[in-house]
């Protein structure tokens, strides 16, 4: 360092403000998701990439099936380590119905409220993981538009496992889950052959979520 080197008024590092995201993960917990620990492994791999804290990224998790449960709120945990421990303990709540519209709408109306830790002016991100067509798909269009109106960026993941197990056509299902994703769809929609393959998309999903920080 030269002797003339001086410290001038410093600029806060870009990373400090850019790491602020409020992320709510909306998990399908119906019985057809199998095995469940593939979901918790996916959560673990995704969450350990995040810098979680009250001034950084916050994560909340909602589980749905026949009804909806807030597993934990955005402001519940203040470190990545705490969130990882909590995510590992999430049990599958079961049920035969897949009320995806209800899950997304509950996340929008409840999980993203200040009471549950959402921060004003911080970008909202929703990650939806499901393995079947919704039983309330007549509500889906409106629910997605409401998310759009509130600037909630949506990543959707279609697990094809139960369709492949039953040798069923995935076409209608994939179209529905694509409709949930934000535009451009090709950057916000993922599909995996089965639950075990969820971990294979973590790196790309993580990169695309973090790319939002810069915008």
């Amino acid at each position: 360092v030269s002797p003339t080197f001086q410290v001038v008024n410093s600029i806060a590092p870009v990373q400090e403000c850019s790491t602020q995201l409020d992320i709510v993960i909306v998990l399908d917990g119906s019985n057809s998701i199998y095995p469940w620990d593939s979901v918790t492994a996916f959560l673990n791999d995704l969450l350990e990439r995040m810098d979680i804290g009250p001034k950084q990224t916050q994560v909340g998790i909602v589980q749905y099936g026949e009804n909806v449960t807030h597993e934990f709120n955005l402001n519940k945990y203040s470190s990545t380590e705490e969130v990882l421990v909590a995510a590992k303990k999430i049990v599958q709540r079961g049920g035969r119905q897949t009320m995806t519209a209800l899950g997304i709408d509950t996340a929008r109306k409840e999980a993203f409220t200040e009471a549950r830790g959402a921060r004003r002016g911080v970008k909202k991100v929703m990650v939806i993981v499901t393995d079947g067509e919704s039983h309330d798909n007549h509500r889906l269009k409106k629910v997605i538009q409401d998310c759009e109106d509130e600037n909630i960026q949506r990543f959707s993941i279609a697990i094809l496992g139960s369709y492949n197990r039953g040798n069923l056509s995935t076409e209608k299902f994939v179209e529905e889950i694509k409709s949930i994703a934000s535009e451009p769809t090709e950057k916000h929609f993922f599909n995996v052959s089965d639950e075990l393959a969820l971990v294979t998309i973590v790196k790309t999903l993580g990169e695309r979520i973090f790319a939002l920080e810069a915008t």
């Epitope: 019985n31 199998y34 469940w36 035969r96």
Partner: antibody, heavy 124, light 108 residues
Framework: EVQLVQSGAEVKKPGESLRISCKGS????????IGWVRQMPGKGLEWMGI????????RYSPSFQGQVTISADKSISTAFLQWISLKASDTAMYYC??????????????????WGQGTLVTVS | EIVLTQSPGTLSLSPGERATLSCRAS???????LAWYQQKPAQAPRLLIY???RRATGIPDRFSGSGSGTDFTLTISRLEPEDFAVYYC?????????FGQGTTVEIK
């Protein structure tokens, strides 16, 4: 804590009817399938059938179809296994077990993660 | 119906030894959907392994499962006194559940 508690041992005569029960607790019983498994004296395990207490959808193993009836009452979180006319060959230990998995959309799959303590049925 | 054949029928070993139990299916088991259960006298079966290799909650790491297709193995790396029991494999890849006939692990 997930628990499946079965009704007590039964001693019956051939031709009599019987209903045994399996009460679940510690989880949403109406949201998980419950299976029934037979174990004859000194023998292995045989899957009999499975029920979804939420709507009483039932599937049977071909070997047990028409031999037994599986039912459930979600209001009391209980599944039942019933015989109209018992035979000596029905003498066995009967277990209920919770399915971690599913049985819809054209396929059944999953493992049994929690088991009841068993009900011994003796027919003689 | 998929038939599962377990071998050997009986395994006589001493505590501390390694136990290798085999389960062979009459046809390919999709997605590795095979589970292993342990049953002790006068007790209900207890889940050990599912999806061929995943240990159930609370199961010690001396138990491990492997295999795919038609051939599956349960290995107990070092037998403890409480491990002497009957072990059953079970498949669930064909819209029904079938069990093997069981392997008894007894004290030599």
């Amino acid at each position: 804590e997930v628990q499946l508690v079965q009704s007590g041992a039964e001693v019956k005569k051939p031709g009599e009817s019987l209903r045994i029960s399996c009460k679940g607790s510690g989880y949403s019983v109406s949201s998980y399938w419950i299976g029934w498994v037979r174990q004859m004296p000194g023998k292995g395990l045989e899957w009999m059938g499975i029920i979804y207490p939420g709507d009483s959808d039932t599937r049977y193993s071909p070997s047990f179809q028409g031999q037994v009836t599986i039912s459930a009452d979600k209001s009391i979180s209980t599944a039942f296994l019933q015989w109209i006319s018992l035979k000596a060959s029905d003498t066995a230990m009967y277990y209920c077990a919770r399915l971690q998995g599913d049985c819809s959309g054209g396929s059944c799959y999953g493992h049994f993660d929690y088991w009841g303590q068993g009900t011994l049925v003796t027919v003689s | 119906e998929i038939v599962l054949t377990q071998s050997p029928g009986t395994l006589s070993l001493s505590p501390g030894e390694r136990a290798t139990l085999s389960c062979r299916a009459s046809q390919t088991i999709s997605s590795g959907y095979l589970a292993w259960y342990q049953q002790k006298p006068a007790q209900a079966p207890r889940l050990l392994i599912y999806v061929a290799s995943r240990r159930a909650t609370g199961i010690p790491d001396r138990f491990s499962g492997s295999g795919s297709g038609t051939d599956f193995t349960l290995t107990i790396s070092r037998l403890e006194p409480e491990d002497f029991a009957v072990y059953y494999c079970q498949q669930y890849g064909s819209s029904s559940w079938t069990f093997g006939q069981g392997t008894t692990v007894e004290i030599k």
